[in-house]
Amino acid sequence: APVPPGEDSKDVAAPHRQPLTSSERIDKQIRYILDGISALRKETCNKSNMCESSKEALAENNLNLPKMAEKDGCFQSGFNEETCLVKIITGLLEFEVYLEYLQNRFESSEEQARAVQMSTKVLIQFLQKKAKNLDAITTPDPTTNASLLTKLQAQNQWLQDMTTHLILRSFKEFLQSSLRALRQM
């Protein structure tokens, strides 16, 4: 499911519970996606020893995965709500092609990979409603994305495993950074 179910069984026993605010819904959605990534990483890590490798050992790759930097306004120092929100949405839009690549990369977690992809689309919609400056958000070019996808799928098995691992790790880090920033807003 692209939207997380209730937090726990207590939800059922609390019919008068306040509906979630926009911020709470976004927070919950990110946590739901992170749980999905965690499940996918388990399968990936069980198949190879890449998860034990240090970041430095895996740094030499030509993937242009979105990453938070000081200038994006999402860190505690230099925090800027509007700049940060634009970065989060832009980054998630850029991750979509990589999430598409992850489809068919998992045997026992195929549904989980689809759920992560669909949940991310929902998260983008939630965030776009929150953003004031939608004009500043650049959407990736579909043609460029299509050729990137073809190129990634043409890699040998080892590189595809490495790519899968790097996408999951980078996406996890991006979402964690986003969550920390959104909780400051």
Epitope: L34, E56, A69, Q76, Q176
Partner: antibody, heavy 116, light 110 residues
Framework: SLEESGGRLVTPGTPLTLTCTAS????????VTWVRQAPGKGLEWIGI?????ETAYATWAIGRFTISKTSTTVDLKMTSLTAADTATYFC??????????????WGQGTLVTVSS | AIQMTQSPSSLSASVGDRVTITCQAS??????LSWYQQKPGKAPKLLIY???TLASGVPSRFSGSGSGTDFTLTISSLQPEDFATYYC????????????FGGGTKVEIK
């Protein structure tokens, strides 16, 4: 394991850098936090380093404390030290697998004494 | 800014007693709360995370509950090695805070 070093007796106003060194794993895969404890007092959170460049600090530590990271060490740089900074300083590891901060591996601490 | 208030600050109990320590957050932190045990001259040790999940190697007499703003650490039957100081810690947000930890609860022998 984690080990802190660099703690010593310093005079007020002297800058000091503490180092947290990892054995058996690479710190690049983890978040690292610094916590201090004044003699006979409770735990006081100082700050955390996430990736290579994202940090967060307690409100009272901003501007006076700086955390930086390499693959094997995490440094805590302290400036304008006063007697109130006298404490045992601990570094701790957060496995970074989830979104909530929790510190599951700690060093034994290094004592910093600020006195004239 | 999230503040953590722990109570009591100290308590006296006997071996075999059931001990309860509470921790209150100044705003909702979901279930993002951990409990630590610290013995004199030693580093803290993680006991419970996510409010109720026991850390590896921690005896089952320790349990945690709560979500939102109110949390509880319970020791079902106090053992001699449990006399120590216990701290709660919020992991929800480490920005714009004075301290992530509660003030601590010292569990002493009656």
């Amino acid at each position: 394991s984690l080990e802190e070093s660099g703690g010593r007796l310093v005079t007020p106003g002297t800058p000091l850098t503490l180092t947290c060194t990892a054995s058996g794993f690479s710190l690049s895969n983890y978040y690292v936090t610094w916590v201090r404890q004044a003699p006979g007092k409770g735990l006081e959170w100082i700050g955390i380093i996430y990736g290579s460049d994202e940090t967060a600090y307690a409100t009272w530590a901003i501007g006076r404390f700086t955390i930086s990271k390499t693959s094997t060490t995490v440094d805590l740089k302290m400036t304008s030290l006063t007697a109130a900074d006298t404490a045992t300083y601990f570094c701790a590891r957060d496995d970074s697998s989830d979104w909530d901060a929790k510190f599951n591996l700690w060093g034994q601490g290094t004592l910093v004494t600020v006195s004239s | 800014a999230i503040q953590m208030t722990q109570s009591p600050s100290s308590l006296s109990a006997s071996v075999g007693d059931r001990v309860t320590i509470t921790c209150q957050a100044s705003q909702s932190i979901n279930n993002e709360l951990s409990w630590y045990q610290q013995k004199p001259g030693k580093a803290p040790k993680l006991l419970i995370y996510r409010a109720s999940t026991l850390a590896s190697g921690v005896p089952s007499r320790f349990s945690g509950s709560g979500s939102g703003t109110d949390f509880t650490l319970t020791i079902s039957s106090l053992q001699p090695e449990d006399f120590a100081t216990y701290y709660c810690q919020q992991g929800y947000s480490l920005r714009n805070i004075d301290n992530a930890f509660g003030g601590g609860t010292k569990v002493e022998i009656k």
